[in-house]
C-alpha cells in the first residue's frame, strides 16, 4: 500500500511480486460511505499505471487484468471522480515484477595475505530486478560451520571475517552460496580449497637495490616478505620501453641478484610473490621501485668530420665537428670532450677539453701535417679517442665523385646521388656527405652536418636538419687514404618562386658599356635554390617589351656588365631572381643614361 | 505487434446516423479499457468516447453525449461507436485507441495507431 487508504483499498491477486509474463488483477474498491453523494452511478472510478489512464468504472469497485508489465516495479493508483470535482486518490500498490535467482556461478574465496579474512566473489548471473537475499556458508574441518548474508541490490561479494591458519595447511574448506527471492532459490556449485589454495600473499615491500663499488655488474634487489613465501617472480624494465624482462626465483629470501641491466639507465622494478610451486596464486605485484644504474665508461667512438679554410700565406682555419654517442654508448652524463692537436713530424701536441659544443676552432699554420684525437668522457672515463689526419679533402680532383645530383625526396629530404670517381672506384675507402646552409658570404657559423656512406654506396638520403625553402650546399668527400676528392652541389627538399627580386644598388659606366650591382636577396625570401637572375631593361616610356640577360647564379656574384645600351637614352632597368619553380617579382626599378659616344 | 483497423465512416447528411467499427489485433484486447478519438480538418486530437475492459462502463465527451453510444465485443476483437444525430461539427477522422493513449483525456497519437476513417457530415 502506498497511503492510507481511508477511502478504499487495492488489492493485487495472486500477489504483489510476480514472473515476467504474468498477469494480475487489481480491484479497487471504496468504502461505505466514501463515493460520491452516496449514489454508486455517479462513482467513476480510474486505474492509473504511473500518469496514465488504463481503465475506468462507474461504481464501487473497479476489477483490471493487467498483462505485459515490465520488469521492475510498476506503480497502480486508484482515483475517484466525481462530477463538478477533482480526481480525489483512493489507493494504490506497487506491483514488483523480476524472475527467480540464476544458479551463482564462478564462485571463488580469496585470503588477501596470512593474517587476512576469507572473502569469496561469485557471478549472480542475469538480474532479478527483486530484492534478493545471498547466503555463503563456508564449512571446515571438526564440523566448524561460517554463514553470512547479504541484502545489497547487487550482491556478489562477501566477506566471512575469519583467518584461516597455516597449522594445517592440506585441511579442506567448502564454500557455497545461495541467492533466495520470493519467486524461487538457487545454489550454487560447492568450491573446495585449501590453506594454501586461496591464500594470496600480500605483494612484497620495502624494496630496495644496491649496487656494490658502484657498478652496474654487480647488482642486488631486495626486498621483504611475508614468512609463507616459497616463490618470486621479479619483473624490471627501462622507464622508456613498455617490455619487461621476468625473471622466477624459488627461495630466494629476499634479494636476488641482476646481470644484465645497462649502464646509466632508469629502471622500473616489481616483485611478486606465492606461496606454492603449483597451489594457490600469486600476489598483486609490488609498488614500483624505480632506481638508476650507474654510469660505466664510454664505448664507441666519435664520428669527427672538419673543414679547412684559408686564412693568409702561413696560416689555415680548422673547424672540428663531432656527434653525441649515443645514450647506450655514452653509458653515462658526457662531462666534457678532450681534443688533441699533435703535429706529426715535430711532435708537438695540444689538448683541450670541451665541454658544452660538440665542435672546436683553431688556427694552426699552413705547413706540417696535422692530426687530431677527439674522445668523449664521463665520471667513469673516456671513449676510445678517433683518430683524423687534417688533409686537404678536395686535393685530388681523380677522386672527385661524379655526376653529383641532389633531388627533392618527399617532405624535407633530399636524395643526393652520384657515380664513383674516374680514379680506381676501388680505392675509396667511404664517402662522406656534408651539407650545410647555403648562406653568401660563406659564413662559417652555420651548423654542419654530415654522413658516412660505404664505398659502394652511390646514393644518400639526408634529412638531418632539412628544411623547406631552404638551398643547401651539398658536397660528396671520396677517401681513400690521406687523400680525399670532392664535389659540390647546391640542392633543397622544396622550393617555389623567389619572393623578392634582387635589389640594384648601383649603375656605373665603364667604357659603353654598364655594370650593374645589386644586393643578393635575403636568404629566407629566396625560397630554395637560385637558379638565374635575369637584368631587364626597356627605353622609358616606351611600350615595347623589355630586352632582358640571364646570368647562371654564383653564390659569390653581385655585379654584371651589359653593352648592349644606346648612348643618350634613358632606360629602366630591374631584375628578377629564379628558382625551378619559377620566377620572383621585380626588385626595384632604376633609371640610367649612358653618356658615351654613338658609334 | 499491436495493429487497430478502423471502418464505416462516409459522408452522410446531418441528423444521418453512421457506425464505426475497429479490428483490434496483437495484444490481450479484454484486458484494455478502448477509446474513439478524432481530428477535424487543422485541428488538435479530441477524445470522444471510451469503454472499460469490462464493457460496462462508458464515458462520452460532453459534445457527444446522449447522440454517441461506444461498446465493445471481446470474443470478436471490436470496438464500434453508434454515430446519430450527426451534426457539421462530428466531421473529422475517427479513430480508435487504447484508453492509456489518453490520459486526462489528452490524447498522443501511438505508432500502432491505424489509418482513422473519416467522417462528412454536409448537406
Known amino acids: 500500500k502506498i497511503d492510507a487508504c481511508k477511502r478504499g483499498d487495492v488489492t493485487v491477486k495472486p500477489s504483489h511480486v510476480i514472473l515476467l509474463g504474468s498477469t494480475v488483477n487489481i480491484t479497487c474498491s471504496l468504502k461505505p460511505r466514501q463515493g460520491c453523494f452516496h449514489y454508486s452511478r455517479r462513482n467513476k472510478l480510474i486505474l492509473y499505471k504511473f500518469d496514465r489512464r488504463i481503465n475506468f468504472h462507474h461504481g464501487h469497485s473497479l476489477n483490471s487484468q493487467v498483462t505485459g508489465l515490465p520488469l521492475g516495479t510498476t506503480l497502480f493508483v486508484c482515483k475517484l471522480a466525481c462530477i463538478n470535482s477533482d480526481e480525489i486518490q483512493i489507493c494504490g500498490a506497487e506491483i514488483f515484477v523480476g524472475v527467480a535467482p540464476e544458479q551463482p556461478q564462478n564462485l571463488s574465496c580469496i585470503q588477501k595475505g596470512e593474517q587476512g579474512t576469507v572473502a569469496c566473489t561469485w557471478e549472480r548471473g542475469r538480474d532479478t530486478h527483486l530484492y534478493t537475499e545471498y547466503t555463503l556458508q563456508l564449512s571446515g574441518p571438526k564440523n566448524l560451520t561460517w554463514q553470512k548474508q547479504c541484502k545489497d541490490i547487487y550482491c556478489d561479494y562477501l566477506d566471512f571475517g575469519i583467518n584461516l591458519t597455516p597449522e594445517s595447511p592440506e585441511s579442506n574448506f567448502t564454500a557455497k552460496v545461495t541467492a533466495v527471492n520470493s519467486l524461487g532459490s538457487s545454489s550454487s556449485l560447492p568450491s573446495t580449497f585449501t590453506f594454501l589454495d586461496i591464500v594470496r600473499p600480500l605483494p612484497p615491500w620495502d624494496i630496495r637495490i644496491k649496487f656494490q663499488k658502484a657498478s652496474v655488474s654487480r647488482c642486488t634487489l631486495y626486498w621483504r616478505d611475508e614468512g609463507l613465501v616459497l616463490l618470486n617472480r621479479l619483473r624490471y624494465r627501462p622507464s622508456n620501453s613498455r617490455l619487461w624482462n621476468m625473471v622466477n626465483v624459488t627461495k630466494a629470501k629476499g634479494r636476488h641478484d641482476l646481470l644484465d641491466l645497462k649502464p646509466f639507465t632508469e629502471y622500473e622494478f616489481q616483485i611478486s610473490s606465492k606461496l606454492h610451486l603449483y597451489k594457490g596464486s600469486w600476489s598483486d605485484w609490488s609498488e614500483s621501485l624505480r632506481a638508476q644504474t650507474p654510469e660505466e665508461e664510454p664505448t664507441g667512438m666519435l664520428d669527427v668530420w672538419y673543414m679547412k679554410r684559408h686564412i693568409d700565406y702561413s696560416r689555415q682555419q680548422i673547424s672540428l665537428f663531432w656527434k653525441n654517442l649515443s645514450v647506450s654508448e655514452a653509458r653515462g652524463k658526457i662531462l666534457h670532450y678532450q681534443v688533441t692537436l699533435q703535429e706529426l713530424t715535430g711532435g708537438k701536441a695540444m689538448t683541450q677539453n670541451i665541454t658544452g659544443h660538440t665542435s672546436w676552432t683553431t688556427v694552426i699554420p699552413r705547413t706540417g701535417n696535422w692530426a687530431v684525437a677527439v674522445s668523449a668522457a664521463n665520471s667513469k672515463g673516456s671513449s676510445l679517442p678517433t683518430r683524423i689526419n687534417i688533409m686537404n679533402l678536395c686535393e685530388a680532383g681523380l677522386l672527385a665523385p661524379r655526376q653529383v645530383s641532389a633531388n627533392s625526396e618527399g617532405m624535407d629530404n633530399i636524395l643526393v646521388t652520384w657515380q664513383p670517381p674516374r680514379k680506381d672506384p676501388s680505392a675509396v675507402q667511404e664517402y662522406v656527405v656534408e651539407w650545410r646552409e647555403l648562406h653568401p658570404g660563406g659564413d662559417t657559423q652555420v651548423p654542419l652536418n654530415w654522413l658516412r656512406s660505404r664505398p659502394y654506396n652511390v646514393s644518400a638520403l639526408i634529412s638531418e636538419n632539412i628544411k623547406s625553402y631552404i638551398c643547401y650546399e651539398i658536397r660528396v668527400y671520396a677517401l681513400s687514404g690521406d687523400q680525399g676528392g670532392c664535389s659540390s652541389i647546391l640542392g633543397n627538399s622544396k622550393h617555389k618562386a623567389p619572393l623578392s627580386g634582387p635589389h640594384i644598388n648601383a649603375i656605373t659606366e665603364e667604357k659603353g658599356s654598364i655594370l650593374i650591382s645589386w644586393n643578393s636577396i635575403p636568404v629566407q625570401e629566396q625560397m630554395g635554390c637560385l637558379l638565374h637572375y635575369r637584368i631587364y631593361w626597356k627605353e622609358r616610356d616606351s611600350n615595347s617589351q623589355p630586352q632582358l640577360c640571364e646570368i647562371p647564379y654564383r653564390v659569390s656574384q653581385n655585379s654584371h656588365p651589359i653593352n648592349s645600351l644606346q648612348p643618350r637614352v634613358t632606360y629602366v632597368l630591374w631584375m628578377t631572381a629564379l628558382t625551378a619553380a619559377g620566377e620572383s617579382s621585380h626588385g626595384n626599378e632604376r633609371e640610367f643614361c649612358l653618356q658615351g659616344k654613338a658609334n | 505487434q499491436v495493429q487497430l483497423q478502423e471502418s464505416g465512416g462516409g459522408l452522410v447528411q446531418p441528423g444521418g446516423s453512421l457506425r464505426l467499427s475497429c479490428a483490434a489485433s496483437?495484444?490481450?484486447?479484454?484486458?484494455?479499457?478502448m477509446s474513439w478519438v478524432r481530428q477535424a480538418p487543422g485541428k488538435g486530437l479530441e477524445w470522444v468516447s471510451a469503454?472499460?475492459?469490462?464493457?460496462?462502463?462508458?464515458d462520452y465527451a460532453d459534445s457527444v453525449e446522449g447522440r454517441f453510444t461506444i461498446s465493445r465485443d471481446d470474443a470478436k476483437n471490436m470496438l464500434f461507436l453508434q454515430m446519430n444525430r450527426l451534426k457539421p461539427e462530428d466531421t473529422a477522422r475517427y479513430y480508435c485507441?487504447?484508453?492509456?493513449?489518453?490520459?486526462?483525456?489528452?490524447?498522443?497519437?501511438?505508432?500502432?495507431w491505424g489509418q482513422g476513417t473519416q467522417v462528412t457530415v454536409s448537406s
Open positions: 485507441a487504447k484508453y492509456e493513449d489518453c490520459s486526462d483525456y489528452v490524447c498522443d497519437r501511438a505508432g500502432y
Open positions: 496483437g495484444f490481450t484486447f479484454s484486458t484494455y479499457a
Open positions: 469503454v472499460n475492459s469490462g464493457g460496462l462502463s462508458t
